[in-house]
């Protein structure tokens, strides 16, 4: 991305450099180094200090966003002297040109949509490009299918999420022939942006005294197991007065998802539908199709 790197250094420089693609800060190794330290300070004065790499002349920042501008700093002591150097990493380009209102969601277990809006001061010829890097392998995914508005990219559709990990870095760059365009970046957890499908294979079986509802957990992008799910059942008596409260039942995920409830014959016509959520986030899916049981003359 286009970004000015300005170095603030004493006479003998460490030649500090930052590669935004790998998030690696490096400097010239000094002989007889006794102490090295690197860190960044963001606009809110938060300090991030990663571990030094084995060679002690570089460090990699794992989970940082750069679009608000940051200052990197390196301190090195040798047996002879001490070095200090700052590297300013501003988000160059005209203020207000970066993509805004950026958000992504995963749906149907293996599809993802990201959307954004053009910056308020962005020129007419602005074009945005989305790059995604996963936290583990630093592999870069370029947007394969852009969603356009009057020729400007304002979203991205991905139908192959195999390159993602649980936490990913999203970067929206911009270009224009007229002026410099600022970038926008964000870190997103797949856990927090996935919208579940409703549970599948919902069935109801009744005997003379009880009804048993069974269902299967939804297929998800994240690898989740049965205890990671929470379900809500809406058991609804048909043809009741408007405003009558539905019975909402919370059920924890289990190896065999089932809910048994008393319902004696003759039973009125009922419907049941189920929705699912991650037990810790409770971001509810849409409801499953309603399944009817009982009879009109119950």
């Amino acid at each position: 991305e286009k970004s000015d790197l300005r170095t603030v250094a004493p006479a003998s420089s460490l030649n500090v450099r930052f590669d935004s693609r790998t998030m690696n800060l490096s400097w010239d190794c000094q002989e007889n180094t006794t102490f090295s330290k690197c860190f960044l300070t963001d606009k809110k004065n938060r300090v991030v200090e990663p571990r030094l790499s084995n060679n002690e002349c570089s460090c990699t920042f794992r989970e940082i966003c750069l679009h608000e501008g940051v200052t990197f700093e390196v301190h090195v002591n040798t047996s002879q002297r001490g070095f200090q150097q700052k590297l300013l990493y501003p988000n160059s380009g005209r203020e207000g040109t970066a993509a805004q209102n950026f958000s992504c969601f995963i749906y149907n277990a293996d599809l993802m949509n990201c959307t954004w809006a053009r910056g308020p001061t962005a020129p007419r010829d602005v074009q945005y490009f989305l790059y995604i890097r996963n936290s583990k392998r630093r592999r870069e995914i370029r947007c394969p299918y852009y969603i356009q508005d009057s020729g400007t990219h304002v979203g991205c559709h991905l139908d192959n999420l195999s390159g993602l990990t649980s936490r990913n870095y999203f970067l929206v760059n911009g270009t224009s022939r007229e002026i410099g365009i600022q970038f926008f970046d964000s870190l997103l957890d797949t856990k927090k942006i996935e919208r579940f499908n409703p549970p599948s294979n919902v069935t109801v079986r009744c005997n003379t005294t009880h009804c048993l509802v069974r269902w299967k957990q939804p297929r998800t992008y994240q690898k989740l197991s049965y205890l990671d799910f929470q379900y809500q059942l809406d058991v609804h008596r048909k043809n009741t007065q408007p405003g009558t409260e539905n019975l909402l039942i919370n059920v924890s995920g289990d190896l065999e998802n089932r809910y048994n409830f008393p319902s004696s014959e003759p039973r009125a016509k009922h419907s049941v539908k189920i929705r699912a959520a991650d037990v810790r986030i409770l971001n509810w899916s849409s409801w499953s199709e309603a399944i009817e049981f009982g009879s009109d003359d119950g």
């Epitope: 649980s166 994240q222 690898k223 197991s225 049965y226 205890l227 990671d228 190896l255 037990v279």
Partner: antibody
Framework: QVQLVQSGAEVKKPGASVKVSCKIS????????IHWVRQTPTKGFEWMGG????????VYAQRFQGRVTMTEDTSIDTAYLTLSSLRSDDTAVYYC?????????????WGQGTMVTVSS | QAVLTQPSSVSGAPGQRVTISCTGS?????????VSWYQQLPGTAPKLLIY???KRPSGVPDRFSASKSGTSASLAITGLQADDEADYYC???????????FGGGTKVTVL
């Protein structure tokens, strides 16, 4: 009702290998993830390895690396643990367990355990 | 030496409340990774009691509850019963070991 049924107790000589099986009934193995944990009176519970969704493969605990292999035969809903180059301190009860949650791993259901004795 | 530290034993009279502590470090419970608790009756396999720090699987009575704060967690048993006499283990994940870690176990005796 889902159950994990493990193979019977084994007595092995040092240097030998042991293969423990874990048969799942009431559910399809292909829809589950199995981990293996052992228990000794001195060291307590030790995680040995299992499926890691982030890596999309079976991962092994560092201390068993190179000696342990975990395999599955989904056609007969059975998971296997093989431990080679057995030593006397491998004497333990070996458990297979179904992963109930991945964040972090929680063991929702355990097999009954297989006692492995390593003795010359 | 277990990675998570538990008292070796606790005891209480029937109907009483007992608590079991589980202390970890910044690479496991404090990381923060969730804690699970298991009950192991003599001669049997462990059974899950608590997951995600404080959630009970279906079938586990609400006499069992748990909480987590910082680098430690605790399990409480209220209305102690004779069949609660068992070993109890805490478990979490450790990022430095890249795997599950357990406590050494606490024997609960009903007086």
């Amino acid at each position: 009702q889902v159950q994990l049924v493990q193979s019977g107790a084994e007595v092995k000589k040092p240097g030998a290998s042991v293969k423990v099986s874990c048969k799942i009934s009431g559910h399809s193995l292909s829809e589950l993830s199995i981990h293996w944990v052992r228990q000794t009176p001195t060291k307590g519970f030790e995680w040995m390895g299992g499926f890691d969704p982030e890596e999309n493969e079976i991962v092994y605990a560092q201390r068993f690396q190179g000696r342990v292999t975990m395999t599955e035969d989904t056609s007969i809903d059975t998971a296997y643990l093989t431990l080679s180059s057995l030593r006397s301190d491998d004497t333990a009860v070996y458990y297979c367990a179904i992963v109930g949650s991945f964040s972090p791993v929680t063991y929702g259901l355990w097999g009954q355990g297989t006692m492995v004795t390593v003795s010359s | 030496q277990a990675v998570l530290t538990q008292p070796s034993s606790v005891s209480g009279a029937p109907g009483q409340r007992v608590t079991i502590s589980c202390t970890g470090s910044g690479s496991n419970i404090g990381a923060p990774y969730d804690v699970s608790w298991y009950q192991q009756l003599p001669g049997t396999a462990p059974k899950l009691l608590i997951y995600h720090n404080n959630k009970r699987p279906s079938g586990v009575p609400d006499r069992f509850s748990a909480s987590k704060s910082g680098t430690s967690a605790s399990l409480a048993i209220t209305g102690l019963q004779a069949d609660d006499e068992a070993d109890y283990y805490c478990q979490s994940y450790d990022s430095s070991l890249s795997g599950s870690v357990f406590g050494g176990g606490t024997k609960v005796t009903v007086l």
